[in-house]
């Protein structure tokens, strides 16, 4: 099914406009901003979601040390260019003709340049490290229970195949979720780790992208897991190319 048939809405993306104008009167949904048709049985790509967001009214155990090549999304929101499949185009430019290259999750991986900047290919982000700090609790969560609960969440809520959740680390109050997905591992129909991480990030911030589903209520054996800080690191299959001046 492409969308909820009974009331013609998109369960996996509330930033859509839906109408029963598909083949045979089927419900069809299009993303705001781009007008692209979306498959409502799975997550919408981060690129289309960012584009929709920019078009919306403007109201309102041993922990992993990220590698030297890990990227953090410091640039924040921008209005991206998406390809016909909804993926980020390798080169992104703003209205003032400033351009840069991005990875498959839309995070800048080069210095900014002008229109002559070339981005030969969209470099895949194959490893995502989600770093969370939870609010104080009476005691530490049981590691195995926490691990299982987060794996269940990514399977059930985001439809991410269990093989892509590489590890869950916990050193109270820090939780780290490692997602890994090489190009060769990702089969047709598999949810992309970048999309799953983005939905999770928005859920954690209380900005759920799901239609008609309650917000994220994370519990470990009934004990609420409340996140007070999130940092996401992105590792690409090819290391990013920044000049030394950025590092100083």
């Amino acid at each position: 099914h492409t969308a909820a048939q009974d009331n013609c809405t998109c369960p996996t993306n509330k930033m859509t406009v839906c109408s029963p104008d598909g083949p045979g009167g089927r419900c069809q949904c299009r993303a705001l901003g781009s007008g692209m048709a979306v498959d409502c049985s799975t997550l919408t790509s981060k690129c289309l979601l960012l584009k929709a967001r920019m078009s919306a009214p403007k109201n309102a155990r041993t922990l992993v040390r990220p590698s030297e090549h890990a990227l953090v999304d410091n640039d924040g929101l921008y209005d991206p260019d998406c390809d016909p499949e909804g993926r980020f185009k390798a080169r992104q430019c703003n209205q003032t003709s400033v351009c840069w290259c991005v990875n498959s999750v839309g995070v800048r991986r080069t210095d900014k340049g002008d229109l002559s900047l070339r981005c030969d290919e969209l470099v895949r982000t194959h490893h995502i490290l989600i770093d969370l700090r939870h609010r104080p609790t009476a005691g530490a969560f049981n590691h195995s229970d926490l691990d299982a609960e987060l794996r269940r969440l990514f399977r059930e809520r985001y439809r991410l195949h269990p093989k892509f959740v590489a590890a869950v680390h916990y050193e109270q109050p820090t939780i780290q979720i490692e997602l890994r997905q090489n190009t060769s591992q990702k089969a047709a129909g598999d949810v992309d780790i970048g999309d799953a991480a983005y939905y999770f990030e928005r859920d954690i911030k209380g900005e759920s992208l799901f239609q008609g589903r309650g917000g994220l209520d994370l519990r470990v054996r009934g004990e609420p897991l409340q996140v007070e800080r999130t940092l996401i690191y992105y590792l690409d299959e090819i290391p990013p190319k920044f000049s030394m001046k950025r590092l100083t």
């Epitope: 049985s41 794996r151 809520r157």
Partner: antibody
Framework: EVQLVQSGPEVKKPGASVKVSCKAS????????IGWVRQAPGQGLEWIGE????????YYTQKFKGRVTMTADTSTSTAYMELSSLRSEDTAVYYC??????????WGQGTLVTVSS | DIQLTQSPSSLSASVGDRVTITCSAS?????MYWYQQKPGKAPKLLIY???TLASGVPSRFSGSGSGTDFTLTISSLQPEDFATYYC?????????FGQGTKLEIK
């Protein structure tokens, strides 16, 4: 073809332990989850817990915690569920089932465990 | 724990009848799953994500609902449909099943 083949029926005395095996074929074992469900005679389905085969992460329901142990041998693509301190109420058919982005997509044929003095 | 209550617990119907089984959850769930079980056999996945038919399942089966109320419908009963049906949720641990609905020949 995805297959889950379980071990044969068992008869145990109260207080004993039983270990049920579930041999998988037709898929990459460590990419999936194996859940365990039981069904007492003439009754409904009851979930026991699950094991993530790649990481060894396990979740048991509170009812069985302390009495159940789930393990996996990746070299033989076999999952195991051991239940200890058996009582007559544990008489049931025990099923293993594969989990992916669905909770249970393929099921084993079931193993009847009879607890009787 | 989320309790699932199926209605009715048993049902007698004839070939060709339209049959509806409901499943009510004690708190809101994202999706419902339905299984069919025949005597002496393992359950078989029938419907996932509330309304999507599993591979090989005939189109006479359909599922609907949201939140706490879900429905399984068989539009025209066939002889092979007489079995027990279970709903199941996994929106939170522990996964739970309904008590089952036994569909018998009238």
């Amino acid at each position: 073809e995805v297959q889950l083949v379980q071990s044969g029926p068992e008869v145990k005395k109260p207080g004993a332990s039983v270990k049920v095996s579930c041999k998988a074929s037709g898929f990459t074992f460590t990419d999936y989850v194996i859940g365990w469900v039981r069904q007492a005679p003439g009754q409904g389905l009851e979930w026991i817990g699950e094991i993530y085969l790649g990481s060894g992460t396990i979740y048991y329901t509170q009812k069985f915690k302390g009495r159940v142990t789930m393990t996996a041998d990746t070299s033989t693509s076999t999952a195991y569920m051991e239940l200890s301190s058996l009582r007559s109420e544990d008489t049931a058919v025990y099923y293993c089932a594969r989990g992916s982005i669905f909770p249970f997509d393929y099921w084993g044929q079931g193993t009847l465990v009879t607890v009787s003095s | 724990d989320i309790q699932l209550t199926q209605s009715p617990s048993s049902l007698s119907a004839s070939v060709g009848d339209r049959v509806t089984i409901t499943c009510s959850a004690s708190s809101s769930v994202s999706y419902m799953y339905w299984y069919q079980q025949k005597p002496g056999k393992a359950p078989k996945l029938l419907i996932y994500d509330t309304s999507t038919l599993a591979s090989g399942v005939p189109s006479r089966f359909s599922g609907s609902g949201s939140g706490t109320d879900f429905t399984l419908t068989i539009s025209s009963l066939q002889p092979e449909d007489f079995a027990t049906y279970y709903c199941q949720q996994w929106s939170s641990y522990p996964y739970t099943f309904g008590q089952g609905t036994k569909l018998e020949i009238k």
